[in-house]
């Protein structure tokens, strides 16, 4: 069943029964409500596994990466795909399953002793390689979080936002990624015209903080499309 694929955790701290079957452990929503997704896609089934649309690896499960389902496919249509196991071909770290990373186009085991030196080298390699990604640009990398014992402070090298301390996100800076501050109200943010276009940025900004969204600055509405300034604004 879907749940057995997705979740192996026991139900803990269930709410008290309030009538119906809702209080019983493991009970699912009887009729799945329609859920609205960016782009207006609506799925109304619980029993059928539906691919999850994504813009970056961080949105997917721990054993998945975000990419176009067909090689050379439309970069705007991306879903979460199953990670690649050891010795399988890869184009970036996030494609490899936890405990592995992408080296010379192959998923290899993350050797704790040699890992840190090789990771920078591999990141640089993949950026310099024309065939480094499925869809023409690199995106957020993912590796086993056990590589990072403490949360990174601002400026620390990272692979994903969960490697960074609270209030920071993992964003590209030149050819590596570092922990940068999550954007505050009024700060300039990047509004991507198409999904995944953030992969083209050399100096990537974090997302807007809690309660904020990246919207066009009011006094820039008249400006041309290319010069529109977006800032983090209250919802």
């Amino acid at each position: 069943t879907l749940n057995s694929v997705l979740n192996s955790n026991a139900i803990k701290n269930l709410p008290p029964p309030l009538g119906g079957a809702a209080g019983h452990p493991g009970s699912a929503v009887s009729a799945a409500p329609g859920i609205l997704y960016p782009g207006g896609n609506k799925y109304q089934t619980i029993d059928n596994y539906q691919p999850y649309p994504c813009a970056e690896d961080e949105e997917c499960g721990t054993d998945e990466y975000c990419a176009s389902p067909t090689r050379g496919g439309d970069a705007g249509v991306q879903i979460c795909l199953a990670c690649r196991k050891r010795r399988k071909r890869c184009m970036r770290h996030a494609m490899c399953c936890p405990g592995n990373y992408c080296k010379n186009g192959i998923c290899v085991s993350s050797d704790q002793n040699h890992f840190r030196g090789e990771i920078e080298e591999t990141i640089t390699e993949s950026f310099g390689n024309d065939h480094s990604t499925l869809d023409g640009y690199s995106r957020r990398t993912t590796l086993s979080s056990k590589m990072y014992h403490t949360k990174g402070q601002e400026g620390s090298v990272c692979l994903r936002s969960s490697d960074c301390a609270s209030g920071l996100c993992c964003a590209r800076h030149f050819w590596s990624k570092i922990c940068k501050p999550v954007l505050k109200e009024g700060q300039v943010c990047t509004k991507h015209r198409r999904k995944g276009s953030h992969g083209l940025e050399i100096f990537q900004r974090c997302y807007c903080g809690e309660g904020l969204s990246c919207r066009i600055q009011k006094d820039h509405h008249q400006a041309s499309n290319s010069s529109r300034l977006h800032t983090c604004q209250r919802h």
């Epitope: 997705l6 026991a10 493991g26 799925y43 961080e58 499960g61």
Partner: nanobody, 129 residues
């Protein structure tokens, strides 16, 4: 001990607004989806809204889309549900819940209550006509 505690419920007139808050203690939930469910007397628990582990993704039931907004502040271990244009049919006990980031995620992951492994005790929301 891990706890999720909801607050902000109460009695409000139709068309009014309420802001529910869910505060986690005992651990952080950075790598969890945080969801809101509700249950009216004699009815089954139903999905309302969720925000994923990657802060940018929110999901809503059709019945609340455009009226409810969920957000989270990992630094404060808090999740919010801003409810506006409330209707009498929104009357229910509202629960906050946490679902771990799974190995594989599907479109229905966030609305499936059995994927959530931590639950609060709920807060009553009553909308009078």
């Amino acid at each position: 001990e891990v706890q999720l505690v909801e607050s902000g419920g109460g009695l409000v007139q139709a068309g009014g607004s309420l802001r529910l808050s869910c505060t986690a203690s005992g651990r952080t939930f950075d790598n969890h989806a945080m969801g809101w469910f509700r249950q009216a007397p004699g009815k089954e628990r139903e999905f309302v809204a969720a925000i994923s582990w990657s802060l940018s993704r929110t999901h809503y039931a059709d019945s609340v889309s455009g009226r409810f907004t969920t957000s989270r502040d990992n630094a404060k271990n808090t999740v919010l549900l801003q409810m506006s244009s409330l209707k009498p049919e929104d009357t229910a006990v509202y629960y906050c819940a946490a679902a771990p980031r799974p190995k594989r995620v599907s479109v229905s992951y966030f609305s499936t209550s059995s994927n959530y492994d931590y639950w609060g005790q709920g807060t009553q929301v009553t909308v009078s006509s």
